[in-house]
Structures are given as C-alpha cells and as structure tokens.
C-alpha cells in the first residue's frame, strides 16, 4: 500500500486584496487516520490558519464537506484577503495519537501573493 501523499498543486496563488483565496490540498489516502491542519509559514513560529479537529475559523471555509468520511479534499478558502495574509501556506496531515496527534506529512506549500485593490 502506497504511503499517503499531501498534494498542494499550486505553487503560487495571486489574489487581489478584498477577494477570497482558494488554497488547494488533497490527500492520496484515508490512512493514517488523523486531521489536516493549515499553517502559514514553517517551523516553530508557524501560524495556525485552520484546524480540522478543533475550533471555528471565521475567515476560513473548506471547499468540500470534511464531515464526509471518505473525503480527501482539504482545500480551503480564506475570505477578505489583505496584504498581511501574504506568505507560504502548508497543508499538513497529522496522524491520530495519544495524547496528542503527531505531524505526519506536509504539502510542498503554496505561496500566496496579494496585489493591491485597483483604485
């Protein structure tokens, strides 16, 4: 059985300020069981953007319905983009663990660039 891959097909996404950014991510397998999280940036200082397991993130909506048990599309939309949202976004698969889930595999990242709203 092939190991799960996290695929972020878009290396770059350009969005106008005030618009909605779509960041695409798919997993190639349902195994291992565990949530997806999205981060901006890498390393210890990365910023959590969306956590499938916990919380409500008002600016973020999922493209597909993650409550469906066979879902492997973890793409998100971020609304009302501002220049402060620019950065590289990573879709990260976690493996269910006890007491804490363990980071399993990350996508290659999508760099979000924001262009000023046309005046």
């Amino acid at each position: 059985e092939e190991e799960l891959q996290v695929i972020q097909p878009d290396k770059f996404v350009l969005v106008a300020a005030g618009e909605t950014a779509t960041l695409r991510c798919t997993a190639t397998s349902l195994i291992p069981v565990g949530p997806i999280q999205w981060f901006r940036g890498a390393g210890p200082g990365r910023e959590l953007i969306y956590n499938q397991k916990e919380g409500h993130f008002p600016r973020v909506t999922t493209v597909s319905d993650l409550t469906k048990r066979n879902n492997m599309d973890f793409s998100i939309r971020i609304g009302n983009i501002t220049p402060a949202d620019a950065g590289t976004y990573y879709c990260v698969k976690f493996r269910k663990g006890s007491p804490d889930d363990v980071e399993f595999k990350s996508g290659a990242g999508t760099e979000l660039s924001v262009r000023a709203k046309p005046s």
Epitope: P58, T61, P99, D100
Partner: antibody, heavy 120, light 107 residues
Framework: QVQLVESGGGVVQPGRSLRLSCAAS????????MIWVRQAPGKGLEWVAS????????YYADSVKGRFTISRDNSKNRLYLQMNSLRAEDTAVYYC?????????????WGQGTMVTVSS | DTQLTQSPSSLSASVGQRVTITCGAS??????MHWYQQKPGKQPKLLIY???NLEAGVPSRFSGSGSGTDFTLTISSLQPEDFATYYC?????????FGQGTKLEIK
C-alpha cells in the same frame, strides 16, 4: 459500546450553583469535542456550550455566558458543566453529547440526560 | 445567529405514508445541516448528517437533501417506530442552533 452518563442534576434555588458531570466510555474521549444541550419541559433543544477535544476552543450560548463553565478531564473521561447564578429559565433536562473532530460535525451520541429544576 | 425554521410544526400521518419535513435557515449553512429524532423521555438520535448522509444503523427509508438555506428530511414509508419529534440543527458557525421541532403523530 459508546456510553454517556450524566449526573448531578436536582432541585436548586434561584441564584445557587450546581455542577453536572458526564462520564464517557466506549470510545477515545480525547478525540471528541463535547457538547451540553438542554431541553426545557415540553420545549425544543437548545445548545448550551461546547468544548474541543483539547479544551482549546470553548463556546457558550448567549443565554448562559458568564454564568456557566464547561470543562473536561481527558484523563478521567469526564465532561463537566458548572452552573452558577441559576435562574428559573435554566430548568431543563441537560444532555451531554459528543462531536467527532471539528466544529462542523454532528452530535452522534447523546447521554440520557439529567434533570435540573430551579425553583424557590 | 443562524435561525432555523421547521415546517410543519406538527404533522399527522399514517403508516406507509411518505412524509417530508423542511428546515429553512436564515442564512446559508452550506451543507452543515443535521437531522435528529427524539422520542418522548429519550435522548435525541442522529439520523442524517451534513444534509444528505445517512448515519450508520439508520434505516434507508430516511433521507435528506438540500444545501444553503433549504433542507428536507424525507421518510419514504412511515413505520410505527417513526412517530417522534424531528429536529434540524446547523453547525456552519457558532452558536449551534436547532429548529423548533416537528412532531410526527399517528393519524
């Protein structure tokens, strides 16, 4: 099998406090968000509070905000609802329920409920 | 807050009949609408999650449809054990809200 058993209900005077407990078994408690929902006699269901699996995210209904506190102890597989400054309108059956993963998931198992009566 | 309005509030029907209950949301909840059944003196039971997905162990005569603001629960052929109160519930955004319930009674 999945079991959720509420306890701690009873008759209490207005302004007093009560602590409800929900004992969970038959599943990995720490994987699930947990919810309190209440139902006043002869009325519909009202969501009261929810807590995420690691207690990082907590939400309350406006009607109980500042008076009720939801908490959990994953080492004991227990969910709690501390109810302070109780009012007559808090009289209801209180159910605990579980919710797998994130905010958008449904409540797939419920306890049998515990009755809270607020009366002088 | 997202208000949910169920229709009808009560309904009399016969065994074998097809029954439809609707739930309208005051704003879009995408597909994050769930349906529960509650019998007197019992806890609610999940029937349908995320608009159209049948929960494990629930008979296939129950089905759900809809997205956005309009949702439907259908029972294709009523059985005696289906007489109960049905609630819709949204989980698109906090606070979670429930419909006021639809009481299904035997005609």
């Amino acid at each position: 099998q999945v079991q959720l058993v509420e306890s701690g209900g009873g008759v209490v005077q207005p302004g007093r406090s009560l602590r409800l407990s929900c004992a969970a078994s038959g599943f990995t408690f720490s994987d699930y968000g947990m919810i309190w929902v209440r139902q006043a006699p002869g009325k519909g269901l009202e969501w009261v509070a929810s807590i995420s699996s690691s207690s990082s995210y907590i939400y309350y209904a406006d009607s109980v905000k500042g008076r009720f506190t939801i908490s959990r102890d994953n080492s004991k597989n227990r969910l709690y609802l501390q109810m302070n400054s109780l009012r007559a309108e808090d009289t209801a059956v209180y159910y605990c329920a579980r919710r797998y993963y994130g905010f958008n998931y449904p409540f797939d198992y419920w306890g049998q409920g515990t009755m809270v009566t607020v009366s002088s | 807050d997202t208000q949910l309005t169920q229709s009808p509030s009560s309904l009399s029907a016969s065994v074998g009949q097809r029954v439809t209950i609707t739930c309208g949301a005051s704003k879009s909840v995408r597909t994050y609408m769930h349906w529960y059944q509650q019998k007197p003196g019992k806890q609610p039971k999940l029937l349908i999650y995320s608009a159209s997905n049948l929960e494990a162990g629930v008979p296939s005569r129950f089905s759900g449809s809809g997205s956005g603001t309009d949702f439907t629960l259908t029972i294709s052929s009523l059985q005696p054990e289906d007489f109960a109160t049905y609630y819709c519930q949204q989980s698109n955004e906090p606070p979670y809200t429930f419909g006021q319930g639809t009481k299904l009674e035997i005609k």
